[in-house]
């Protein structure tokens, strides 16, 4: 059955109740330098209206402190008013090392990430840090990567593995789940000239992914106790027609295509999931498709196999899928793929339809073909117009945070948490944010803030308290943190 | 060595065709665009278009659509560009060069430059 | 078509001093945190080289004299400090959307 009635149950302490934010830009200096700058000045008010420095006078400064970056006062305000837990958002590679390489580290823009990990740990609210987060504008890559082939080129792997590094070198006693790429099976929308391209792109992330992964593992680890993994877009498919064959075959089709394409290298066998590697061949063999999965190596199997530390999955709705043979040697031909618009379903203004089932059928679906794996939801939301009652956004958090409670309490499915995307709106863009783009809130706030403070959907007479030790342990392993390195 | 290797000068009557080549080595020529230049003596650079040799897709500037053809033979690693209705005013040098379609799409590699003089 | 405007038309350099090159666009060639404009050099009866790329990167084996900056639509080229062999044609190109098109060239002269 599609939907369920809604169950009454809560999550367990230790969910994480989180917000996801895209790529902050760091700001290049502190905005508050009134309190750095040791002269006296007296203004002339009357005359020239300007200031003019009074000298032999030094008076006391005080530390330069990370709220005097604006940006970083703005977004623990917005934080403080979600009452989340986690706070998951991603650094800028291309600000932290302008050349690509180790050569050029920008050390302003690592203080300023610090600052907002070290502010938020004040409040209660632990990072979960993204290392790189392209999106379907913007590539994200240093310059001089973008002009050597970007992830075409199998060094691009190498130079991400050395600024992960560096990350978990200055954040990772701060930071203790890490995101390395960010939907990386979405960069064939970017990389979509032919299969072989996208296909291309999608070895060299995935090489990179376990480098960076290995590092950590190996050097990082054993003082830093994280866990690091990578975000996949996991879409749920269903089969348009529910009463023909050949649309089933499709929705599972596009679970390979989409999830399987990078979780099974990752999760499993350090190879292409077989089915999808089958389906291009067959294409190839017929003289539908030039596209070919690249042949991995043994050492290349070794390296992918077993890179994760749990399943993180960005969903936002569910596809009607039907099967349609395409021409053409690019990713989205090589699939076979028609996707259906449901006008009967309730969809926001960019078409993302609301099937709140859908999440429920994908985490059953990870655990049957992955194992009984944490599984934390990294961003899952919908754009809505509203600027104030955005009731969709409520409505969609409600009907899908109890689909994820269904598959917790009667799946047994281990989800650690959810992260709402997204915390603040850009301008121009489809309307995603709690917070309007000139940080208005909106009133889904509270709808969440409820959820969260009642740890889900209890029964009346249930408690939303948790042991108190349990409460406390992550704010005093903040302030010890805060108080070692500030 | 990346460089392109184009063909040598060629001398042609007014109203006929050329076809002149670009032979690329020491990269997978598949993967990047063959961008075609003009320049006249002593003035400036106009692009002409690009061809992708991937799939032989093609991209004009609207002044070059009627006038260059552009092709490229994957077994030889070698675009073609030809020009027709050749005038007096096409007595110019034409360049190739590669650019990253995906990346900067500036143009790293440069052939030598090919001489066409059109002349009765 | 985005129009490029370089300035000036020539100039005239002694050895060991700055050299400043212009390059205005008609409208923003800046997209996606990327700057899409690029320097090229070029010697008679050779092809033109490029020297920087994305507006502000240097182009491997190009000597660190050569530098670039700029966002949007105003661009400039500097050379410091400038030594003979840097006689030559520069041109800016842009590469922000179809046509290509590149600026008219500024001719360097070393006294």
């Known amino acids: 059955k599609e939907s369920t009635p809604d169950v009454q149950g809560q999550f367990p302490c230790d969910f994480s109740w989180g917000v996801t934010e895209s790529v902050l830009k760091p700001e290049s200096v502190a905005s508050s330098p009134q309190f750095s700058d040791p002269h006296l000045y007296v203004w002339n008010a009357t005359g020239n209206r300007l200031l003019h420095r009074v000298e032999g006078v030094r008076l006391k400064t005080r530390p330069a402190q990370c709220t005097d970056f604006v940006n970083i006062k703005k977004q623990l305000e917005m934080l403080a008013r979600m009452k989340v837990t986690h706070y998951r958002f991603a650094l800028d590679w291309a600000s932290v090392l302008p050349t690509g390489n180790l050569s050029a580290v920008n050390r302003q823009a690592l203080r300023y990430y610090r600052c907002v990990v070290s502010e938020g740990l004040k409040l209660g609210i632990s990072a979960m840090v993204t290392l790189y987060y392209p999106t379907h504008a913007h590539l994200g890559l240093p310059e001089p990567l973008l002009h050597a082939d970007g992830w075409l080129n199998p060094s691009t792997a190498e130079a991400f593995q050395a600024y992960a590094g560096l990350c978990f070198q200055e954040l990772g006693d701060l930071v203790k789940l890490w995101i390395t790429i960010n939907e990386p099976n979405r960069l064939s929308d970017i990389y979509n000239r032919s299969g072989n391209d996208t296909y291309g792109a999608a070895h060299n992330l995935l090489v990179a992914h376990a480098l960076a992964w290995r590092l950590y593992d190996r050097q990082f680890r054993p003082s830093q106790r994280g866990a690091v993994s990578l975000s996949l877009h996991a879409d749920w498919a269903e089969p348009a027609n529910p009463y023909a064959d050949s649309h089933w075959r499709a929705a599972e089709r596009f679970l390979q295509f989409e999830i399987a394409w990078f979780a099974e290298p990752l999760f499993k066998t350090g190879d292409y999931p077989a089915a999808m590697r089958e389906y291009i061949a067959s294409k190839h063999r017929r003289g539908l498709s030039s596209s070919a999965l690249p042949r991995l190596t043994e050492a290349e199997r070794r390296l992918l196999k077993g890179t994760v530390d749990f399943c993180a999955l960005n969903h936002f709705t569910t596809r009607f899928v039907m099967h349609e043979q395409l021409a053409g040697s690019r990713y989205d031909s090589d699939r076979d793929i028609q996707f259906l618009q449901d006008i009967t379903r309730l969809s926001s203004p960019t078409r993302l339809a609301v099937i709140p089932w859908g999440v429920r059928k994908l985490l059953r679906w990870v655990r049957r073909n992955y194992g009984d794996m944490d599984i934390y939801i990294t961003a899952s939301g919908i754009d809505d117009q509203a600027l104030e009652d955005d009731r969709l956004r409520k409505y969609y958090l409600g009907k899908y945070l109890q689909e994820v409670l269904k598959a917790y309490l009667i799946d047994k499915v281990r989800i650690k948490g959810y992260y709402a995307f997204k915390l603040a709106e850009e301008k121009s863009k489809p309307r995603f944010g709690f917070f309007t783009s000139d940080f208005k809130a909106k009133s889904s706030i509270q709808f969440y803030n409820k959820v969260i403070s009642s740890r889900g959907f209890p029964f009346e007479n249930s408690s939303s308290r948790c042991s108190q030790t349990q409460e406390n342990t992550e704010c005093t392993v903040c302030l010890f943190l805060v108080q070692k390195k500030p | 060595q990346v460089q392109p290797q184009e063909s040598g000068p060629e001398l042609v009557k007014p109203g006929a065709l050329v076809k002149i080549s670009c032979k690329a080595s020491?990269?997978?020529?598949?993967?990047?665009?063959i961008n075609w230049m003009k320049q006249r003596p002593g003035q400036g650079l106009e692009w002409i278009g690009w061809i992708y040799p991937g799939d032989s897709s093609t991209k004009f500037n609207e002044n070059f659509k009627d006038k260059a053809t552009l092709t490229a033979d994957k077994s030889s690693s070698t675009a073609y560009m030809q020009l027709s209705s050749l005038t007096s005013e096409n007595s110019t040098v034409y360049f190739c060069?590669?650019?990253?379609?995906?990346?900067?799409?500036?143009?790293?590699?440069w052939g030598q430059g090919t001489l066409v003089t059109v002349s009765a | 078509d985005i129009v490029l405007t370089q300035s000036p038309a020539s100039l005239a350099v002694s050895l060991g001093q700055r050299a400043t090159i212009s390059c205005r666009a008609s409208?923003?060639?800046?997209?996606?945190?990327?700057?899409?404009m690029h320097w090229y050099q070029q010697k008679p009866g050779q092809p033109p080289k490029l020297l920087i790329y994305l507006a502000s990167n240097l182009e491997s084996g190009v000597p660190a004299r050569f530098s670039g900056s700029g966002s949007g639509t105003d661009f400039t080229l500097n050379i410091h400090p400038v030594e003979e062999e840097d006689a030559a044609t520069y041109y800016c190109?842009?590469?922000?959307?179809?046509?290509?098109?590149f600026g008219g060239g500024t001719k360097l002269e070393i006294k």
């Open positions: 020491g990269y997978t020529f598949t993967r990047y665009d």
């Open positions: 060069a590669r650019s990253d379609y995906y990346g900067s799409r500036s143009f790293t590699y």
């Open positions: 409208k923003s060639v800046s997209t996606s945190g990327y700057s899409y």
């Open positions: 190109q842009h590469s922000r959307e179809l046509p290509y098109t």
